[in-house]
């Protein structure tokens, strides 16, 4: 039961995280005009990975896409790449994890296959989360650098009297969404990896003891009502040794707390 819960929770947390990464990537507010210690403007500028926008106090908003690839800063391209890789890996991870979920039965898929798929999706979620966190952090670092550069020459005097105000940009909402989403995806991935350990079959082979009764070839196997005819194919390494009421999920104990990244 604990494995199913851990796996299910990992899937849900990762799903929320990946939805957040997608949302952050699409959001326009990666950087927003810094309003602190600035003249009050009737125009508010904000920028995303794909377009820049201007919202006037009249309520009119105009957005312009970056219709160039070569003209964009390399850092911005890198951030775009990291976010897209994160989304792609996360989407594949979600697809794999759906089939790996213990609560979903697909044909005669073995537990070992489900364990492998759970581990694969977990690793994908971890890498996806790290890509998102890295992408957002690179962009944030870029903003901090530009912020202090523009602060150094915020007012560039022109002929003494006339001044040009340089627009400074600070962290937008998308950065926080990205950090949280990346963290959630990472946590979800870790949970999937933990769940994988519980799904993996044990190596020890518990041999059944056969009692031959006259006239019938019946193999009795301790472990509750798990008896079958001698022709059964129950030779796989299944944990049917325990006669207690516990399910196989409860055999292994797991840490109950996970550190948030």
């Amino acid at each position: 039961m604990a494995v199913t819960a851990c796996q299910g929770l990992g899937f849900v947390v990762s799903l929320i995280g990946i939805a957040g990464i997608i949302a952050a990537t699409c959001m326009d507010q990666w950087s927003t005009q810094d309003l602190y210690n600035n003249p009050v403007t009737a125009v508010f500028n904000y920028q995303g990975l794909w377009r820049s926008c201007v919202r006037e106090s009249s309520g009119f908003t105009e957005c312009r896409g970056y219709f160039t690839l070569l003209g964009l800063p390399a850092m911005l391209q890198a951030v775009r790449a990291l976010m897209i890789v994160g989304i792609v890996l996360g989407a594949i991870g979600l697809l794999v994890s759906i089939f790996a979920l213990k609560c979903i039965r697909i044909g005669s898929m073995e537990d070992s296959a489900k364990a492998n798929m759970t581990l694969t999706s977990g690793i994908m979620f971890i890498v996806s989360g790290l890509c998102a966190i890295a992408g957002v952090s690179v962009f944030a670092n870029m903003l901090v650098t530009n912020f202090w550069m523009s602060t150094a020459n915020m007012y560039t005097g022109m002929g003494g009297m006339v001044q040009t105000v340089q627009t400074r940009y600070t962290f937008g909402a998308a950065l926080f969404v990205g950090w949280v989403a990346g963290g959630l995806t990472l946590i979800g991935g870790v949970m999937m990896c933990i769940a994988c350990r519980g799904l993996a079959p044990e190596e020890t082979n518990y041999k059944a003891v056969s009692y031959h009764a006259s006239g019938h070839s019946v193999a009795y196997k301790p472990g509750g009502f798990k008896a079958s005819t001698g022709f059964g194919s129950n030779t796989k390494n299944k944990k049917i040794y325990d006669g207690g009421a516990r399910t196989e999920d409860e055999v292994q104990s797991y840490p109950s707390k996970h550190d948030y990244v």
Partner: antibody, heavy 118, light 113 residues
Amino acid sequence: EVQLVESGGGLVKPGGSLRLSCAASGFTFSNSAVSWVRQAPGKGLEWVSTITSGVSYTYYADSVKGRFTISRDNAKNSLYLQMNSLRAEDTAVYYCTRQFKGNALDYWGQGTSVTVSS
Amino acid sequence: DIVMTQSPSSLSVSPGERVTMSCKSSQSLLNSGNQKNYLTWYQQKPGQPPKLLIYWASTRESGVPDRFSGSGSGTDFTLTINSFQAEDVAVYYCQNDYFYPLTFGAGTKLELK
């Protein structure tokens, strides 16, 4: 057709109060930023105050800050200007205007006259 | 506050003449985000409320005759009337629409010669 009709002007003593109203029609009032602009007799235009749509941020000219309060009632499609501690220099025709692209004031009312005199 | 300086303060013009008036701001009205200048021109005829002519320094408002044109960037702006007509007699105001308070220039009065 866009219409802005001001009312509430009149003669008031210095230190007195007055509340101007502006009834808007012909456009989606709740989505528009609206402003008050005044013009003293024989003088130029002076921006007084602006209230934005949505969150309703308010902005005031330094000359009226702390004395005038702009507000809006989207349900009634109305804009208001509460004027307290009135001075002789507040005597003017007060125009209600709508903000447009570029923050330009594209529609103006006919104005309401405010006279502050003892 | 942003100071808007208009010149000349008044001008006598003959019909058909080309008119130019200037407006200077104490700070740049160019927004780096969209590369637009937040300067507006208005026309006010005697006894009437002002009328919007040009916004974003050079975009003509719908219904405004094409003889009116705006130009300039940053701090220096110009309103041009290509062929002055009798009905253009009015006071023309420029306005800073970038910084609060949204200041107006003192106006340029156009009279018929």
